[in-house]
């Protein structure tokens, strides 16, 4: 039969594989970012296209309002990379109290918000100083790992500083996520 | 909605210093860059320098030595100093924010007068 | 610095023309090429950025094209309110530097 296999001391039952093609997965790529207001102490998220070139969603995965909707609880790949794009400045000596960026770095995270829970959990983060870059730099950070998530689970990328990001090319600055 | 207003400018005499100041709503400055430029009377845009997000500064090498741009995200705030100020400095003075590249929103800017 | 050089400084046109502004850059400035459109009064706004990607709230009759040192911005059809000053702005490299501007009147 087909997804059993028969041993002569037990037996095993396998479901029947899962064909790839029908997994939730999505990729989004780079628009554009406008300012927005912030949550304190969080960095601003990134918005995404997710239908046009390169970018998709499928098989229930959503992409709303600058989040990634888990459509099915399972272990997901996430992973983004964000391009920035800067000239070399003169990066200050003041450590600024209260400021949620550590000065002259750019930060990429990706987040996850559960809606039972009250407080959005760092999934993976990637930091790089930017005092040292020649004079037009451009700095990929690229972040990416597997994770148990629950149907309901929204993933959004967070950055912290949103007008350095690179919004000119679909390849440079991407999210995305697929249940393994 | 996005706003940024200038305050600041008036009438300074030749020697003096100039401090604007630059109040923004509708995002946060610890996350996006604020650029400054001038607009003299007849003469074309001149873009003085940036401050960004993450805290770094750019100027304009012709007038470095004189300008100092810096801000209060506490009070969502973006200051621009400069100093020995000359009667061509005169000039309606803006800020304005967006990407690194461009700047999307502009405030009404300030005029700077310098005469004696 | 690198030099921009825009053309025409003036132009009278009509409600309906369509309408050419160019900008010269004195180097390759990799497509970061924007346009502003300025009003007495107003706020400065940013019409296109990159080249030719229309910012948000901006009427399609606006366009832009061009690539390496060239670049244009035309305005297929004018409207009233498009008399206005139009300036050209390359971002590519530091520090920003603008065209000396195009003042579109009525004819």
């Known amino acids: 039969l087909k997804g059993q296999e028969f041993a002569p001391s037990h037996q095993q039952v396998y479901a029947p594989l899962r064909a790839d093609g029908d997994k939730p997965r999505a990729h989004l790529t780079v628009v554009r970012q406008t300012p927005t207001q912030h949550l304190k102490n969080q960095f601003p998220a990134l918005h995404w296209e997710h239908e046009l070139g390169l970018a998709f969603t499928k098989n229930r995965m959503n992409y709303t309002n600058k989040f990634l909707l888990i459509p099915e609880s399972g272990d997901y790949f996430v992973y983004s990379q964000v391009t920035f794009r800067g000239m070399t400045s003169e990066c200050s000596e003041i450590r600024q109290a209260g400021r949620p960026n550590k000065p002259d770095s750019i930060t990429v995270v990706i987040t996850k918000v559960t809606d039972s829970y009250p407080e959005p959990t760092q999934l993976l983060m990637g930091t790089k100083s930017v005092c040292e870059v020649g004079s037009n730099w451009f700095q990929p950070i690229y972040l990416g790992a597997m994770f148990s998530l629950q149907e309901g689970d929204k993933l959004m990328v967070n950055v912290s500083d949103i007008s350095l990001v690179d919004y000119t090319k679909e390849d440079k600055t991407f999210f995305g996520a697929f249940l393994l | 909605e996005i706003q940024l207003v200038e305050s600041g400018g008036g009438l300074i005499q030749p020697g003096g210093s100039l401090r604007i100041s630059c109040a923004v709503s509708?995002?946060?400055?610890?996350?996006?860059?604020v650029d400054w430029v001038r607009q003299a009377p007849g003469k074309c845009l001149e873009w003085l320098g940036v401050?960004?997000?993450?805290?770094?500064?750019n100027y304009n090498s012709a007038l470095k030595s004189r300008l100092t741009i810096s801000k209060d995200n506490s009070k969502n705030t973006v200051y621009l100093q400069m100093n020995s100020l000359r009667a061509e400095d005169t000039a309606v003075y803006y800020c304005?924010?967006?990407?690194?590249?461009?700047?999307?929103?502009w405030g009404q800017g300030t005029l700077v007068t310098v005469s004696s | 610095d690198i030099q921009m050089t825009q053309s025409p400084s003036s132009l009278s046109a009509s409600v309906g023309d369509r309408v050419t502004i160019t900008c010269r850059a004195s180097?390759?400035?990799?497509?970061?090429l924007n346009w502003y459109q300025q009003k007495p009064g107003k706020a400065v706004k940013l019409l296109i950025y990159?080249?030719?990607r229309l910012h948000s709230g901006v009427p399609s009759r606006f366009s832009g094209s061009g690539s390496g040192t060239d670049y244009t911005l035309t305005i297929s059809s004018l409207q009233p309110e498009d008399f206005a000053t139009y300036f050209c702005?390359?971002?590519?490299?530091?520090?920003?530097?603008f065209g000396c501007g195009t003042k579109l009147e009525i004819k």
């Open positions: 304005a924010s967006g990407n690194f590249d461009a700047m999307d929103y």
């Open positions: 509708g995002f946060s400055l610890s996350s996006y860059g």
């Open positions: 401050i960004w997000g993450f805290g770094g500064t």
């Open positions: 180097q390759d400035i990799s497509n970061y």
């Open positions: 990159y080249t030719s």
């Open positions: 702005q390359q971002g590519n490299t530091l520090p920003f530097t």
